[in-house]
Every structure is written in C-alpha cells, then in structure tokens.
Interface confidence: medium
C-alpha cells in the first residue's frame, strides 16, 4: 500500500478555494523528489495539473500551486475558482505520475444554493449551538414571534413566543425576546443535528405588516483533521468540545464499515480490548478538553476516529464531535523492539526502549501502564534516577546502548510484576512505546546468595553462579543506586579463555569486597551482557554490621558457594502499592564467608571470574 | 486550562536568600516531574532543578549546595530555596511541568534580580 496520504474525499462550491494536504514519510529522497497533483482520465492515466518543479498546466494557470514542506513531509495543492467542471477524481502523488506512490482525492464542486435576497447564512458543525438574530419594527413589538423551517414550498412552526415548540426541536432551543427598545429577538438551538440544516424565516407579527427574515443554517460534520504516524508510534487526539459540555461523559470511538462508532475509550471506564496496555485518557482540564494517547500503532488501527461528549459515553446525534482521519505509515522510522519481553519468577528482563536517535540528551522515562478508570501511567524510573522507591534495589534505567535505544532492567521479577510499561521521552511524543512484560515458569539462569551480612573490616566474597549458555557473554557486578548501576572493577583471573569448555567448574563471576567498609551496604547486581546488550541480572543485599566477640560469629559456606543449580532465591518478601520487593530486613540472617586475612592486590572491591572448586574467600 | 503560577520573585543582594513558589493545578501536578529553568538576559533557557512524582530531585551543577527544591502535594506547590544568591543566578525563573512526555506545561515566568 502506498505510504502516501491525503483527504479522500474533497468538496467545496463554485467560485470558493480548496487547500488539499498530502503526506509523505519524510526520507532524504522523498523530500527531495517531485510532488505533483494530477487529474484522472477515462484511459487510466493521469494528467499532471500542477508539479513541485514549477509546471501548470493551462487549465491552473493563475489559479493553483503546489507546495512542498520537506521538514514536515508534506505538500499542499491550492486552487482557487473552482468550477463545476474542477469535479472529478485526482491524484497527490511523488516522483513518476504512473509509480504507484500517491493517494486517490475525490474533488467535488457543487452549485451553491439559490438563496433569497438578504438572507443570513449560518455555518456550524454538528452539535454546537446557532443563535438566529430576528429583527422586527416597532409596531411588531407586542406581537407574535416566530421561527418556521422551510421544507419543500411548505413552512413547518419550529417554536413561537406562546411557548409552542415543535418535538424535533424538544429541549434544545428557545426563543428570547428582548427588554423594551430592542428590536430583534433571538433563537437558540442547542446540539445541532444535521437533519437542522436548511432554510428557516423568522416572523414577527402577522398580514402585510409583519417583518421576515431569511436564515439558513448549514450544519456540517466537523471536518477530519489528517493524522499522519509511523507504525509502532504514538498518536495523541487532542480533543476540546467546549465548555457547554465540560462535566459530560467523554469519549473517543472509531467509526466502523456500518458508519457507526465503536467506543475505543470513555470517561466511564470502557475500553476497547484490542488497546489494552496502550492506551490513556488524559485528564480533562477545567474547560472539558482532554486528550487520548494510543502507542504502539498498528495498521489495523488506521481509521477515523471521532471524539465528543454524551452522558451515555458514547456517540448520539446532536452533541458536539471532533474528527480525525488516521494513517500509519508502515516505513516507519521506529525500529522494532519486542512488544512483548517474558521474565521468570525471581528473574529479570532487559527492555529495550527506542526514541528519536535526534535526541540523544531527551529525558528518558519508564512507566507502568495501569487500565483502571481512563487509564494512569505512573512513572517508576527516568534517565537521572528512580522515582518510586518500592522499586528500591531492583530497577534501574540505563542510556546504553544510545544512538536511538535505551535499556530498562527490572529483576526480582514476581508475578505482580506482569503488566504494560510505556517507554517516553520528554522529546519526540510520536516515539512513545509499550512493552508488556509477561511471567512464565522456569527458573533464573543466574544464582547469588538470598541476602549476606558482611563485616566491617572483613573481605567479602558473592559467588554468582551462570549456566554454559552465558559462557561467552561478559559478567559484571555493580552496586544498585537510585542514578543507575555503578560496574565494579573486575580481575582478570586465568587465561581468557577460562569459560570455552564450560565444565561445572567453570560457572562464577564472584565479587569481592576487601576491606568491607560502612559504605558497602546495599544492592549489588550480577549480571551478563555483550556490548552495550544487556541480558539477565541477579541481586543480592549486602548488610554490614561491627565485628562481633571472637567465637560468637556464624559462617555458613555452603549458602556462600551454592551449587550451581541450588536454589538460592530469597523468600521475604513484602507488599507494597501491589508489587512484590525484596526486603533485606525480613531475610533469615545469613553469612558469607569471610576471610579476615589481607587481600593481595589492594583493591577494595573486585569482580572474580573463576572456578567454584577455586573459589575462596580472598582473591588470587 | 492547565496553570502554572510562579510567585516569590524580586531584588536580593549578593549572598541572600529567595524563595520562588510554584501552584499547579492538581491533575497535572500529581503525575508529573515538575521543575525550574531560568533564562539569564541574553541566554538560552536552562536547566535548574527538577523533583519527579516520587520525590527524586535533580539540581544544575551551578547550583548544586545552594538552592533546594521541594514540593508539598497537598497544596499542589513545587518550592525553590535559593540561597547564597550570586549576580550570575540574575534571570527569570519558569516553572515547568512535565508529565512524563505526555504534556509539557510552563509558567509566565518569575524575575529574580541578584544585585548589590
């Protein structure tokens, strides 16, 4: 399908102008490449009327142009001076008339209506409110006032100043006549439907003295605004319907083949399954605007949506509607990255998060997506640091790789964690997207130690336990603070090729702490990851606490060097705001062996990659 | 509409203190990272401090020890301490709320005039 895209459907009447927006994914060549608007023939072909390289045809001559807005990916063709004869099926297209790359426009140039002399013309869309201005002579004053509807040669009684209104106009319109010396009254239709359209005449007073008016009321379905955005993008439907309308159910639908709209999301808590985890209403503001944002775009999800307001929370005839006319674009600028990541209970995940490679130095965020009401994302972390604290020691949101992705880790994985997280920037809003995390069975690939008390003063040793398959991934561990996760120092240990035969005894990464100081309290990750690719982490608390009297201390090696498929997943955990953390004060006191003898080297904290029958409590 | 009203703003010689208030309407002042920027005369617009929903602050190096922010989220209120005031912190403060990239708000604008 053709990535190409513009109005369907164009009307307009003699003697006015048009201004017809084509789209176009704004690639270098795209941008650069010849636009043209062409007019279809009986043969098939299409005649260029109007190019981006300067040429009008006769027919446009002084009357039309075309221009290109390559920032934008747009182009807009003018004409002016329409003519009956303008009606007929055209093209926006780029590069070669014949290619392929453009959009069918439908232009159609009606005869404007034959209306009597002096008569008003009112233009309102559908649902707003008209106020017809009356006027009347003196001697009208005290008599009858009256609003009719002509259909046909025939004059239908709308509403009069004796209180007669008639039922297709029930609760939505009123006559107002003014204080004495004012000679005009007025009448107010509320809610317009689009069978209102047509011609009324006022009357005041009655025989060949009584005073008349013309009106006619044109009522128009809003015009769709043209939405343009990538697949896998974000869209936002910023929708103001007015104040008479502020405290009403709101709504976005889309309408359907049947011309009806589905209800995609309303104030009243419904939503469409097929946006779950991608999509919000945004709160309205005290005028009763608000706004939609829908992520993850799709090409199923093109169409045209309406937006208005209705107690039912859902489209009815006469209340105010806004339109948009949505296209994905499916050469999209937003790579793919997996929409949906699966973790393990007591595991981790890496999401990958694209944005606008343009903005490297945006503000980066992850939130959770939560359904109740119209939707909510609190944020759980931003690029300068986490935001909730019940995400303590678990959660960290890293700028690697860069040029266009960033990365989220969330370990200590339980089920409550499963849900839709949106990926944002404060930059580029059309590069928002969603990544649903989903809980399967299985076990973590990396194991450390439930929690360990260390020492002050003491060296500390974790092992961190990996199966064969990460054997040619990098390992690291770092220390878990609210900015981010600072790498430790590793050591070489043995030739480099310490994991190519991945036999049992060649599976841990272990970190040493020599001396444990006060500062070495907290959360140490051990992870695996190549390049700038982050894999599966493990975290483990780390207390310290003063050395006790000589003989009162425990050590327990076997929790310390845990066989490589042990399971040595922690169990206190704690609810708080509905998700499942770790909390290092609920832990069974446990400790890791410690090695009070000094550390050869000198560097306090290493990263140990060796052997578990080599594993020792000091570094070699 | 959405508002964002700064208050607080005035003359102060070199070595004071000021404190500049922001009030925000509560749906947008619950959900976002709400911070403060400045524009010194004949500058670009940057970055001071920021407090994110959770209570994260961040602060510009130049002003890191010296100014303060805090928010108080039952009157919807963001607060800007600034002490130990320099001629180079001259500039009009804006208010900022972000709402995670949803929305971006911004005040009119607060003039802090740092001179002796």
């Known amino acids: 399908k053709s990535p190409v895209f513009g109005p369907q459907e164009v009307s307009s009447v003699e003697g006015n102008s048009v201004s017809i927006k084509c789209y176009y994914p704004p690639t270098s060549v795209n941008r650069h490449t010849r636009k043209y608007w062409c007019r279809k023939g009986a043969s098939g072909r299409c005649i260029t009327l109007v190019s981006s390289e300067g040429y009008v045809s006769s027919n446009y001559a002084g009357r039309a142009n075309l221009t290109n807005f390559p920032e934008n990916g747009t182009f807009v063709v003018n004409i002016a001076q329409l003519s009956r004869d303008d009606s007929g099926h055209y093209k926006c297209g780029l590069g070669i008339n014949s290619r392929g790359l453009s959009f069918d426009v439908s232009l159609e140039v009606s005869q404007g209506p034959e209306l009597p002399n002096g008569t008003e013309v009112y233009t309102v869309d559908v649902g707003r409110t008209v106020t017809i201005k009356c006027p009347f002579k003196t001697e009208n004053a005290p008599k009858t006032k009256a609003l009719y509807k002509k259909i046909g040669q025939t004059s239908v009684l709308v509403i009069d100043s004796r209180n007669y209104v008639n039922p297709n106009y029930k609760d939505r319109i009123r006559l107002r006549i003014p204080g004495t010396g004012q000679l005009i009254f007025t009448v107010v239709i509320d809610r317009l439907r689009l069978s209102d359209h047509g011609l009324y005449l006022c009357q005041a007073g009655d025989g060949s003295n009584r005073d008349e008016k013309n009106a006619d009321l044109q009522v128009l379905e809003p015009e769709p605004e043209l939405v343009y955005e990538d697949l896998r993008g974000s869209v936002t439907f910023h929708c103001a319907l007015g104040l008479e309308v502020a405290n009403v159910a709101k709504f976005l639908c889309r309408v359907n083949s049947r011309e009806t709209c589905d209800v995609v999301i309303n104030t009243l808590g419904k939503r469409d399954s097929a946006f779950e985890g991608r999509i919000l209403l945004n709160p309205q503001d005290k005028d009763g605007s608000f706004s939609v944002v829908i992520t993850g775009l799709r090409k199923e999800d093109e169409g045209r949506y309406l937006c208005g307001a209705h107690s039912d929370g859902q489209l009815q005839e006469g209340w105010p509607i806004q339109a948009w006319q949505l296209f994905v674009n499916e050469e999209s600028t937003i790579p793919r990255s997996p929409t949906v990541v699966k973790g393990v209970a007591g595991g981790s995940v890496a999401v990958l998060c694209p944005y606008n490679p343009k903005e490297s130095q945006s503000l980066k965020y992850w939130c959770l997506w939560e359904g109740a009401q119209n939707g909510r994302c609190p944020l759980l972390v931003e690029s300068q640091g986490l935001v909730q604290e019940q995400y303590e020691g678990r959660l960290s949101l890293l700028q690697e790789p860069g040029n266009g992705t960033f990365t989220v880790i969330l370990n200590q994985l339980t089920t409550q964690d499963a849900g839709f997280y949106w990926c944002l920037t404060n930059g580029d809003t059309r590069w928002r997207t969603t990544v649903e995390i989903k809980i399967i069975e299985g076990e973590p690939n990396l194991k450390v130690p439930g929690n360990v008390t260390a020492v002050l003063g003491e060296t500390l040793n974790i092992p961190c336990h990996f199966p064969c398959k990460f054997s040619s991934y990098e390992k690291y561990w770092c220390k878990w603070s609210n900015t981010g996760c600072q790498t430790l120092p590793s050591q070489d240990e043995g030739p480099s090729e310490a994991f190519v035969n991945c036999d049992e005894n060649s599976r841990l990464v272990s970190l040493t702490l020599n001396p444990v100081t006060r500062a070495d309290e907290g959360w140490y990750w051990c992870g695996v990851k190549q390049g700038h690719f982050y894999g599966e982490t493990a975290a483990v608390y780390v207390a310290v606490e003063e050395k006790k009297v000589a003989g009162s201390r425990y050590v327990s090696p076997a929790k310390a060097d845990a066989a490589p498929d042990e399971k040595v997943l922690d169990s206190g955990v704690r609810e708080i705001e509905n998700k499942a953390i770790q909390d290092p004060r609920l832990f069974a006191e446990e400790k890791v062996v410690a090695d009070t003898g000094d550390q050869a080297g000198g560097s306090r904290a290493s990263v140990d990659s060796s052997s578990s029958e080599e594993q020792g409590g000091s570094s070699k | 509409q959405v508002q964002l009203v700064e208050s607080g703003g005035g003359l102060v010689q070199p070595g004071g203190s000021l404190r500049l208030s922001c009030a925000a309407s509560?749906?947008?002042?619950?959900?976002?990272?709400m911070g403060w920027y400045r524009q010194g005369p004949g500058k670009q617009r940057e970055f001071v401090a920021r407090?994110?929903?959770?209570?994260?602050?961040h602060y510009a190096d130049s002003v890191k020890g010296r100014f303060t922010i805090s928010k108080d989220n039952a009157k919807n209120t963001v607060t800007l301490q600034m002490n130990s005031l320099k001629p180079e912190d001259t500039a009009v403060y804006y208010c900022?709320?972000?709402?995670?990239?949803?929305?971006?708000?911004w005040g009119q604008g607060t003039l802090v005039t740092v001179s002796s």
């Open positions: 407090i994110s929903p959770g209570g994260v602050t």
């Open positions: 509560g749906s947008i002042f619950s959900a976002s990272v």
């Open positions: 900022n709320a972000d709402r995670f990239g949803f929305e971006v708000y």
